[in-house]
């Protein structure tokens, strides 16, 4: 066992002319806040699986409120490091995901609104009890600075906390067959680590995590008697050399536990424990709640306050998976006609059309626009015989040359507040709405399709939406 | 404006060993990582390694680990990279570049190594 | 280390062109892609970062999409100043690496 560290130094425009503008303002004050996402490194495990390793929300920063005509300093950062606990061994390679939320302080009704600001992400190798390593990420135009540490949790040691130490019970030197713990030499290395649950008695292990039984007990930790009262024992048929010892085929054979949960035999049957996020009688059941903040890219967590409830992902425009976590390519449909270029923004596709053709699919011919150039990425469209730009996202003018304010044309519903991203624009709606243009309320029926919140969790607490 | 400037050209023999400066401007020294690049003639791009000039920390490519050294000089704002036990396909342009681990935004003019006997 | 693969590996196209260059990456690198610009006898220029990120300086005509495994880099309408080649970089897992290139030429 043992703990993940992070320590944010530094979150602010990264250098060059083209550095964002404060996230803050004097209208709308607001202040930052981490989260953190960790996954084995080398598992196979799909882009949509949830934290395996753990996750941790950092506390809020001290609220910040931009000088006017200033340029964006290094945001206040919350004090102290993220930590995220980790119960087995620390597995040396390791994927994390750190995303930057803004918490807006201004006059919403009903409480603050969340934003995401920047994501960074990346695959380190990392033994525990080393030194801190450092890392420097660019998201669109903000930079982070951070490092990063895994620390075993006494009296685990080593460099992924699997051998244990103990005081020295004498002083001169340790036990027959243990060596002392560096660095602690004034400490003995314990013995192995054996499984989880592997029977003190009837067990013993070589290696770290196995269970190894004496003769005459059986099972994954040898707490199951090997039957000796008859040879037409349930168990299996007897054997020439060793009598009735050899099991037949047991409840545990083949592991009837999904999902990473280790098998033991009952005298009657068989029981799972299953790991941290899991539940149900072999591991089959998601115990993740919407406290572990499971859903991505602004999908909604609903049920899953307690354990025995599964949550649901309700997911944005443009995003599915359990989790919210893949991007839909709805460009594989071949939506656009007359050759033009698919483009997936998430909230909405766009087709990029050919010379001469215009139209939200490209539909439409229009050989009077064969000699017009639209800069930036925007087609020229035809309308009532005259012809003009239809703009890509962040321009506008008659030639799409100006940068444009995405939020100009007030995109987003139900009251909620716009502010452009390095990505396009992100809404952050007013309670009571979601989706990636509030246009979805919450619950339609009159029911609060939100479950009540966690223990120490406000209703709308960005964990839910994370 | 940040500058990274190369030493020259080297010619070295089988076996013996490259020393490569890079001389860092306009930004201050410490903040950023320097990272080492290398192209053969006609050929790609590999990743050698990088130092962190605030706390000397280096990682390497492990197809480079045992070969490459890289070392700084705050007082000259200068890192140097040196590969050792050189072979024919050492041979390439050396490059180092500015950077986080996710981005290598400035590059200096390049430093072609030739290995020869 | 991660594979990215270019494709394709050289096209000829002409001023005005609308070009489109992928990288697919041998697993989930989430959106840490890089493209560089590179002329003969020059070092690499870092022209998107992050996938989708515009580096300053660079002509908006360059734009990069794609997460996850696939990714393109576009240049909307070609200049004669464009025709170099062009590399992707994963900087998701260490070591970085580097596509193949695709070397652009004038028709």
């Known amino acids: 066992a043992g703990v993940f560290e992070l320590q944010i130094h530094s979150f602010g425009p990264g250098p060059g002319p083209g550095a964002p503008r404060s996230p803050c303002s004097a209208r709308l004050p607001c202040r930052l806040f981490f989260r953190v996402c960790l996954k084995p490194g080398l598992s196979e495990e799909a882009a949509e699986s949830p934290c395996a390793l753990g996750a941790a929300l950092s506390a809020r920063g001290p609220v910040y409120t931009e000088q006017p005509g200033a340029p964006a300093p290094d945001l206040p950062l919350p004090d102290g490091l993220l930590q995220v606990p980790f119960r087995d061994a620390w597995p040396g390679t390791f994927s994390f995901i750190i995303e930057t939320w803004r918490e807006e302080l201004g006059d919403q009704i009903g409480g603050p609104a969340w934003s995401l600001l920047a994501r960074v992400a990346g695959r380190r190798r990392l033994a525990a009890g080393g030194p801190w390593a450092r890392d420097i990420q660019r998201a669109g135009a903000w930079e982070l600075r951070f490092s990063y540490r895994a620390r075993c949790e006494p009296p685990a040691v080593g460099t992924a906390c699997t051998r244990l130490c103990r005081p020295r019970s004498a002083p001169s030197r340790c036990g027959p067959g243990l060596r002392p713990c560096a660095p602690l030499e004034d400490e003995c290395e314990a013995p192995l680590v054996c499984r989880a649950g592997c029977s003190p008695e009837h067990g013993f292990c070589e290696q770290p995590g196995e269970c190894r039984c004496l003769e005459g007990w059986t099972g994954p930790l040898c707490t199951v008697p090997v039957s000796t009262s008859s040879c037409l024992s349930p168990r299996g048929p007897s054997s020439a050399t060793t009598g009735c010892l050899v099991p037949g085929p047991g409840p545990c054979d083949g592991n009837p536990c999904a999902n990473g949960g280790s098998c033991s035999e009952t005298p009657r049957s068989f029981e799972c424990t299953c790991p941290r996020g899991f539940y149900g009688l072999r591991c089959e059941v998601s115990g993740v709640t919407c406290a572990d903040g499971p859903c991505f890219n602004g999908g909604l967590c609903v049920g899953g306050a307690d354990p025995d409830s599964a949550y649901i992902c309700h997911c944005p425009p443009g995003f599915q998976g359990s989790n919210c976590e893949k991007r839909v390519d709805r460009c594989s449909l071949q939506p656009c006609r007359n050759g033009g270029l698919c483009l997936d923004l998430g909230h909405a596709l766009r087709c990029r059309c050919r010379a001469g053709f215009a139209g939200p699919r490209c539909e439409h011919d229009l050989d009077d626009c064969a000699g017009r150039a639209c800069a930036n990425g925007g087609t020229c469209v035809e309308g009532g015989g005259a012809h003009r730009c239809s703009c890509a996202l962040g321009f506008g003018g008659r030639d799409c040359r100006e940068r444009a304010d995405p939020c100009a044309a007030r995109p987003c519903a139900h009251g909620g507040r716009c502010y452009a991203h390095f990505s396009g624009l992100v809404c952050a709606c007013a309670p009571g709405y979601m989706g990636a243009r509030c246009e979805f309320p919450v619950h339609p029926d009159g029911a609060s399709a939100l479950p009540a919140a966690p223990p120490g969790l406000r209703p709308g607490d960005p964990q839910r939406y994370l | 404006q940040v500058q990274l400037v190369q030493s020259g050209a080297e010619v070295k023999k089988p076996g013996a060993s490259v020393k490569v400066s890079c001389k860092a401007s306009?930004?201050?020294?410490?903040?950023?990582?320097i990272h080492w690049i290398r192209q053969a003639p006609g050929q790609g791009l590999e990743w050698m390694g990088y130092?962190?000039?605030?706390?000397?920390?280096?990682e390497f490519n492990q197809n480079f680990k045992d070969r490459v050294t890289m070392t700084r000089d705050t007082s000259t704002s200068t890192v140097y990279m040196e590969l050792s036990s050189l072979r024919s396909e050492d041979t390439a342009v050396y490059y180092c570049?500015?950077?986080?681990?996710?981005?290598?935004?400035?590059w200096g003019q390049g430093t072609t190594v030739t290995v020869s006997s | 280390a991660i594979q990215l693969t270019q494709s394709p590996s050289s096209l000829s196209a002409s001023v005005g062109d609308r070009v489109t260059i992928t990288c697919r990456a041998s697993?989930?690198?989430?959106?840490?892609l890089a493209w560089y610009q590179q002329k003969p006898g020059k070092a690499p220029k870092l022209l998107i970062y992050?996938?989708?990120s515009l580096e300053d300086g660079v002509p908006s005509r360059f734009s990069g999409s794609g997460s996850g495994t696939d990714f393109t880099l576009t240049i909307s309408s070609l200049q004669p100043e464009d025709f170099a080649t062009y590399f992707c970089?994963?900087?998701?897992?260490?070591?970085?690496?580097f596509g193949g290139g695709t070397k652009l030429e004038i028709k």
């Open positions: 570049a500015h950077g986080g681990s996710n981005f290598f935004d400035y």
């Open positions: 306009g930004y201050t020294f410490t903040r950023y990582w």
């Open positions: 130092i962190n000039p605030t706390t000397v920390y280096t």
């Open positions: 697993e989930n690198i989430y959106y840490n």
């Open positions: 992050t996938a989708n």
């Open positions: 970089k994963q900087a998701y897992d260490v070591p970085p690496t």
